[in-house]
């Protein structure tokens, strides 16, 4: 389950005589460059994140899903390290997203693929707690749009992540990691897993189609999506241009 | 359906002024960066500007720095260009495109033409 | 900046013929490179997003390639509609760059 080591070497940031924290503070010093890099956010050992730079500053990707290459049916502490390939398909890992967020709110975008090829970005405000809190996920703002209202908790309400053998999900009847799969901030289990088993087709039975990655309030309840990308920034002011 | 539709071209002296606008529609506006990009016959395609989602970080190519401003207004769902002290090398046709941050430019305008001559 | 070289600039085709075009990176860019097709008079059209990923409506005749600095897009049986200009953009570095062009043209 550990993150494979990059082919490149990170790139140079010689501009600030230490580690970058995460991506947006790279964007801040100038750099426009998308990859790999290494990282150290306050108190944390450093590791790699792949960054994508944008009109928004710097993103850091967390989550990518397009070909079903790896396995996202993990334990805990699979999801709590990270695992799969950061030129590929791959979870970050909880513990390094929360030492990038640290207790800032911070700015998610998720951005989904049908199997048409059509596409949808949402942008989220939210506060990523720490493992004593089962890494809940909580909006701290209005969800943007008609989309996401129905899928994510409603402002204030905080969700913790929930895996097959860490039971955290609003369910008290069910597991939802174990009836549907992966690792997610399930809630009640119908709203959405993007870490769910990867489908090249729609499954005939509803059983197995449950387990699928889906976004209720895009395609619907269950559709299986064709991929997923996952970015995180933590708030601060707009990155200066 | 997204559309983004651009308007406010047309010829103008050196020197002088003019704003385009861009009309989005068919997406959540708020979510996507925009920008503008103009081509030309001799030069191509290439990136004027760009604005994030909140309208609070702008980016400009080199050689229009200090005469172009780029804006947006979310609750209208419009971004603008406002270019002033125009040259003739500014003569292009001007597209507005969304910046869907994963793949970047997914859809443009029909595009606008930009003609300075006196 | 990243320089995006595109070759050939012109190219004079018979329809059914399979067709390449190359973009070359100044530098490596991942695979944050799209192609676009634009026709006389109209808006670029994206066919391809990061690399090789089809946009929706693009026929499957269109398929991209490539990694680090090289990259190809491919035509596999030409059609008369396909003849117009084809355009490259990096976008691993912000805020992007785009190739010059080829112009596809019928023999």
């Known amino acids: 389950p550990e993150m494979a080591q990059p082919v490149d070497p990170a790139h140079n940031v010689s501009r600030l005589h230490r580690l970058p924290r995460d991506c947006q503070e790279l964007f801040q010093v100038g750099e426009r460059q998308s990859g790999l890099f290494e990282i150290q956010p306050q108190g944390s050992p450093p590791f790699l994140v792949n960054c994508k730079m944008t009109s928004d500053g710097g993103w850091t990707v967390i989550q990518r899903r397009h070909d079903g290459s790896v396995d996202f049916n993990r334990p805990w502490e699979a999801y709590k390290a990270g695992f799969g390939d950061p030129h590929g398909e791959f979870w970050l890992g909880l513990e390094k997203v929360h030492s990038i967020t640290g207790d800032r709110n911070s700015r998610l975008a998720v951005q989904l693929r049908d199997w048409d090829g059509n596409a949808e970005l949402l942008q989220f405000s939210v506060h990523l707690g720490g493992e004593d809190t089962a890494y809940s996920l909580q909006l701290t703002a209005p969800v943007a749009g008609q989309l996401g209202a129905t899928t994510v908790p409603p402002s204030g309400l905080s969700v913790p992540f929930s895996t097959w053998d860490q039971d955290h999900d609003l369910r008290r009847d069910k597991n939802c990691a174990k009836s549907l799969s992966g690792g997610w901030w399930f809630g009640t289990c119908s709203h959405s897993n993007l870490n769910g088993q990867y489908f090249r087709s729609i499954p005939q039975q509803r059983q197995k189609l449950k387990k699928g990655i889906f976004w209720k309030t895009w395609r619907g309840r269950y559709y299986p999506l064709q991929a997923t990308t996952m970015l995180i920034q933590p708030m601060a002011a707009e990155a200066a241009s | 359906e997204v559309q983004l539709v651009e308007s406010g071209g047309g010829l103008v002296q050196p020197g002088r002024s003019l704003k385009l606008s861009c009309a989005a529609s068919g997406f959540t506006f708020s979510n996507y960066g925009m920008a503008w990009v103009r081509q030309t016959p001799t030069k191509g395609l290439e990136w004027v500007a760009s604005?994030?989602?909140?309208?609070?970080?702008?980016y400009y190519r080199d050689s229009v720095k200090g005469r172009f401003t780029i804006s947006r207004d979310n609750a209208k769902n419009t971004q603008y260009l406002q270019m002033d002290s125009l040259r003739s090398e500014d003569t292009a046709t001007y597209y507005c495109?969304?910046?869907?941050?994963?793949?970047?430019?997914?859809?443009w305008g029909q595009g606008v033409m930009v003609t300075v001559s006196s | 900046d990243i320089q995006m070289t595109q070759s050939p600039s012109f190219l004079s085709a018979s329809v059914g013929d399979r067709v390449t075009i190359n973009c070359k990176a100044s530098?490596?860019?991942?695979?944050?490179l799209n192609w676009y097709q634009q026709k006389l008079g109209e808006a670029p059209k994206r066919l391809i997003y990061n690399t090789n990923n089809l946009q929706t409506g693009i026929p499957s005749r269109f398929s991209g390639s490539g990694s680090g600095t090289d990259f190809t897009l491919t035509i596999s049986s030409l059609q008369p509609e396909d003849f117009a200009t084809y355009c490259c953009l990096q976008h691993n570095s912000f805020p992007g760059t785009f190739g010059g062009g080829t112009k596809l043209e019928l023999k």
């Open positions: 530098q490596k860019i991942n695979k944050y």
């Open positions: 604005i994030s989602t909140g309208g609070g970080n702008t």
């Open positions: 495109a969304r910046d869907s941050t994963v793949d970047y430019f997914d859809y």
